[in-house]
Interface confidence: medium
Amino acid sequence: NSLFNQEVQIPLTESYCGPCPKNWICYKNNCYQFFDESKNWYESQASCMSQNASLLKVYSKEDQDLLKLVKSYHWMGLVHIPTNGSWQWEDGSILSPNLLTIIEMQKGDCALYASSFKGYIENCSTPNTYICMQRTV
Amino acid sequence: NSLFNQEVQIPLTESYCGPCPKNWICYKNNCYQFFDESKNWYESQASCMSQNASLLKVYSKEDQDLLKLVKSYHWMGLVHIPTNGSWQWEDGSILSPNLLTIIEMQKGDCALYASSFKGYIENCSTPNTYICMQRTV
């Protein structure tokens, strides 16, 4: 237990969020970070994973309603599996119906997140900014 | 000290953010909430104050870089003082130079925040969504 050495007292009227990597956004106990540098999907995934996170996974409009207001397009962890035609997240879980509106912007097997819960299909090799996410336990 | 009754252990590799009102966004120990309902500036200010917060104050591009990616227009706490022509925050502090690009969209004495650190002048009576902010100590 040696890693745990700070004690924090929390007022009942408010609450702490996290824990998250330093200077990440914390919302409803999930951690998010928006990265400015443009990378292809694979390098974006590698960047997130090197920070003990994954590319954005959209699992709930309620718990992730902050995503409504995100400007521009950013890689998320959604990929097309050609063999069965489904869209799946990096961890292998299936995209739940009615969570995202999938729009075919380009031919491709990766998807960009855009505001108001839209997913734009894009070629995985195209450089884009990206969103990393870490779910707290 | 009766309000403080939760103890949290924090891993050194990560950190907690806050405290913030429940389900607010926490970033670099500031708390933010985006409100969907459209209100005029005065009602928006009252709404934030009733939650022990104020309308958004932009004080640092570095500490508030999450605001770069905010879509749409939202009331912030910036108001025009006709007597001296300056733009001030609710707390009376002057708008720092080079923080916001002020754009005259309408005749008015209030300002809407828009992505990439822009401020749009608007009539204070016009209904808009708004951003509340609470700075943690």
Epitope: W41, Y42, E43, Q45, A46, S47, M49, S50, N52, S54, V79, I81, Q88, E90, D91, G92, S93, I94, D109, C110, C124, V137 | -
Partner: antibody, heavy 121, light 107 residues
């Protein structure tokens, strides 16, 4: 598409060894190369993975504790696992593996043939 | 770390039998679970990913089910080539972990 492993063999306790895995038939730079080991008559144990692209990002199991190091050579489409401070408990078959799709990192459909590492005095 | 508990550790069955192997995760992993088959002296072979999706080229007698923490691999009619050891593996997050394995032997 295949993964061809090399290296391995007999090493004394405290010694070091390098095991490598050459990829062919696919774009190495878009995949994660993963390493898994299996002690004699035991189950599979994940060691870690390295991204084949420019970032060369790595991820390790907690138990590795700095003793093992992953590296990769983009020009050679090769990933290597450097094993240091070896003990008898590290005696195992070491496998490299590749995910089923470039977009995955944790589901493996292509495996190397395995390389046996024996630690004994 | 997520622990994966597989049962039974071994079982004896005859050709034509229906065989069921279970795997339990120590926390909710949605459907992020894979099943592998391994024969002596060979590398593992992916059978099923995402809990229930059959890998290309794998016979349809293999099926997977489950979500959350409880998962099942079923072989509807055991064939001679199916005698092997089967492993589950979660793909939810790092570090990855495998179940202890289930050895399917001839009765």
């Amino acid at each position: 598409q295949q993964l061809e492993q090399s290296g391995g063999g007999l090493v004394t306790p405290g010694g070091s060894l390098k095991v490598c895995c050459k990829a062919s038939g696919f774009d190495f730079t878009t995949y994660w190369m993963t390493w898994v080991r299996q002690a004699p008559e035991k189950g599979l144990e994940w060691i870690g993975c390295i991204h084949g692209g420019d970032s060369g990002a790595t991820y390790y199991a907690n138990w590795v504790n700095g003793r093992f190091t992953l590296s990769r050579d983009i020009d050679q489409s090769t990933g290597c696992l450097q094993l240091n401070s070896l003990t008898a408990a590290d005696t195992a078959m070491y496998y490299c593996a590749r995910p089923g799709y470039p977009s995955w990192s944790k589901t493996f459909d292509l495996w190397g043939q395995g390389t046996m590492v024996t630690v004994s005095s | 770390d997520i622990q994966m508990t597989q049962s039974p550790s071994s079982l004896s069955a005859s050709v034509g039998d229906r065989v069921t192997i279970t795997c339990q995760a120590s926390q909710d992993i949605s459907n992020a679970l894979n099943w592998y088959q391994q024969k002596p002296g060979k590398a593992p072979k992916l059978l099923i990913y995402a809990a229930s999706t059959l890998q290309s080229g794998v016979p349809s007698r293999f099926s997977g089910s489950g979500s959350g923490t409880d998962f099942t691999l079923t072989i509807s009619s055991l064939q001679p080539e199916d005698f092997a050891t089967y492993y589950c593996q979660h793909s939810n997050s790092f570090p990855l972990t495998f179940g202890g394995g289930t050895k399917v032997e001839i009765k």
